[in-house]
């Protein structure tokens, strides 16, 4: 039942030799190898007008191997394919072609993009970012005290980086100015320079900003009439409203 092609070829060529080279089990002067030693793959190579049989440890580029019970045979992949699973399914295309679902294409179908590293058509991946973190505390020069106008920041992570044709990533951090009621730095928070500066004198700007709120107690003392106090309270309320407005509108984005 298991008629062999090798046997037929041997009948056609009486000059079959048993003393073959390069892994051949049987060979002929005209056709080269007719069969191979165990575990080697038989491949027919076209040289000009004739086909020469060669025995190799694995199939060459552009061929795939089938291990039949009586012969390991190499079969040619499709013309544009470098490595294939079988006739229908390519797994690596020749240079200049892109692999898509087992086929070699000269350009990728719509909705897909070429990955020039793997030489495959892949789905376009868009950037994905996480939700924003909460805003950081209002800070200035790394401190949360000793100032009135500072900045606060929020960040987000990139969950999925985009592919070449995907949507670009949005900014990953956002900074805005913030205004807080001045708070004196406690001893631990105050640096040497800060202490010396305070000891010398309060500058004009600070004197202007100082109010009778509990945060600025002891910085300035004066006797006020009830009318003056009422005026002062009105001014503070206006200031507070302006500060809230500013916090809403001022926003700086940075991309990393």
């Amino acid at each position: 039942q298991n008629a062999s092609r090798g046997r037929r070829q041997r009948r056609m060529h009486p000059n079959v030799s048993q003393g073959c080279q390069g892994g051949c089990a049987t060979c002929s002067d005209y056709n080269g190898c007719l069969s191979c030693k165990p575990r080697l793959f038989f491949v027919l190579e076209r040289i000009g007008m004739k086909q020469i049989g060669v025995c190799l440890s694995s199939c060459p580029s552009g061929y795939y191997g089938t291990r039949y019970p009586d012969i390991n045979k190499c079969t040619k992949c499709k013309v544009d394919c470098d490595t294939c699973f079988n006739k229908n399914f390519c797994t690596k295309c020749k240079s200049g072609f892109y692999l898509h679902l087992g086929k070699c294409l000269d350009s990728c179908p719509e909705g897909l993009e070429a990955n020039n590293h793997t030489m495959e058509c892949v789905s376009i991946v868009h950037c994905e970012a996480s939700e924003w973190s909460p805003w950081s505390p209002c800070m200035k020069k790394g401190k949360t005290c000793g100032f009135k106008r500072g900045t606060e920041t929020r960040v987000r992570d990139i969950l999925q980086h985009p592919s070449a044709k995907g949507n670009l990533c949005p900014p990953t951090s956002e900074t805005r100015t913030c205004i807080v009621q001045r708070k004196k730095c406690s001893k631990g928070e105050r640096g040497k320079k800060g202490r010396e500066r305070k000891r010398k004198k309060l500058n004009k700007e600070e004197r202007k900003e100082t109010s009778s709120s509990s945060d600025s107690k002891g910085l300035e003392s004066s006797i006020e009439t009830p009318d003056q106090q009422e005026n002062k309270e009105r001014q503070q309320q206006q200031k507070r409203r302006a500060r809230d407005k500013q916090q809403k509108s001022v926003s700086v984005s940075t991309v990393h």
């Epitope: 298991n2 092609r5 291990r67 039949y68 019970p69 699973f85 079988n86 399914f89």
Partner: antibody
Framework: EVQLVESGGGSVQPGRSLKVSCAAS????????MAWVRQAPKKGLEWVAT????????YYRDSVKGRFTLSRDNTKSTLCLQMDSLRSEDTATYYC?????????WGQGIMVTVSS | DIQMTQSPASLSASLGETVSIECLAS??????LVWYQQKSGKSPQLLIY???RLQDGVPSRFSGSGFGTRFSLKISGMQPEDEADYFC?????????FGAGTKLGLK
């Protein structure tokens, strides 16, 4: 569109013969090794036999060797499985398939029942 | 012959659930493994070849992995149309051998 259409199934008594055929279209039949794969009722898949693309070599599973004969006609794109000395354990749906390491194309299957 | 051991024999999954089917080869078969899907009353259809490559038309929720002797088929998000029998087959050498199959049902 690739099509493999089986015919010739039916019921036979143990020890009798049956021939199932497969007509192929939609692909280059002469490029492919062709096979029969069977599936007993409520069971798994079992490879039966393969004939290589040019018809020069055939391979059979041990349990059918000497009883089944596989042949092909590349000019007509047909595959035939001659089943002799049938046994009850040969009862199955027989699928014709293009065999190139994997079974890439399958027929719809034909039922063969061996029962007394 | 190379023996293919498939597990589990059957399982049921809820819609959207991730499902895995294992296939073990009795010897090293490199990545020469194929998966088939067979829906009730139909012929098998090739799903994955070369252990991890999807056949044209197969949804991307299906994926295959493995090399050597251990392989698996994963369905990320079970759908009603995935209810079927699944078979692995080694394509490393003749004679071709199949796993016993896994019946996947919908809960």
């Amino acid at each position: 569109e690739v099509q493999l259409v089986e015919s010739g199934g039916g019921s036979v008594q143990p020890g009798r013969s049956l021939k199932v055929s497969c007509a192929a279209s939609g692909f280059t039949f002469s490029d492919y090794d062709m096979a029969w794969v069977r599936q007993a009722p409520k069971k798994g898949l079992e490879w039966v036999a393969t004939i290589i693309y040019d018809g020069s070599r055939t391979y059979y599973r041990d349990s059918v060797k000497g009883r089944f004969t596989l042949s092909r006609d590349n000019t007509k794109s047909t595959l035939c499985l001659q089943m002799d000395s049938l046994r009850s354990e040969d009862t199955a749906t027989y699928y014709c398939a293009a065999h190139d390491r994997s079974f890439d194309y399958w027929g719809q299957g034909i039922m063969v029942t061996v029962s007394s | 012959d190379i023996q293919m051991t498939q597990s589990p024999a059957s399982l049921s999954a809820s819609l959207g659930e991730t499902v895995s089917i294992e296939c073990l080869a009795s010897e090293d078969i490199s990545n020469d493994l194929v998966w088939y899907q067979q829906k009730s009353g139909k012929s098998p259809q090739l799903l994955i070849y070369a252990a991890s490559r999807l056949q044209d038309g197969v949804p991307s929720r299906f994926s295959g992995s493995g090399f050597g002797t251990r392989f698996s088929l994963k369905i990320s998000g079970m759908q009603p149309e995935d209810e079927a029998d699944y078979f692995c087959q080694q394509s490393y050498k003749y004679l071709p051998t199949f796993g016993a199959g896994t019946k996947l049902g919908l809960k």
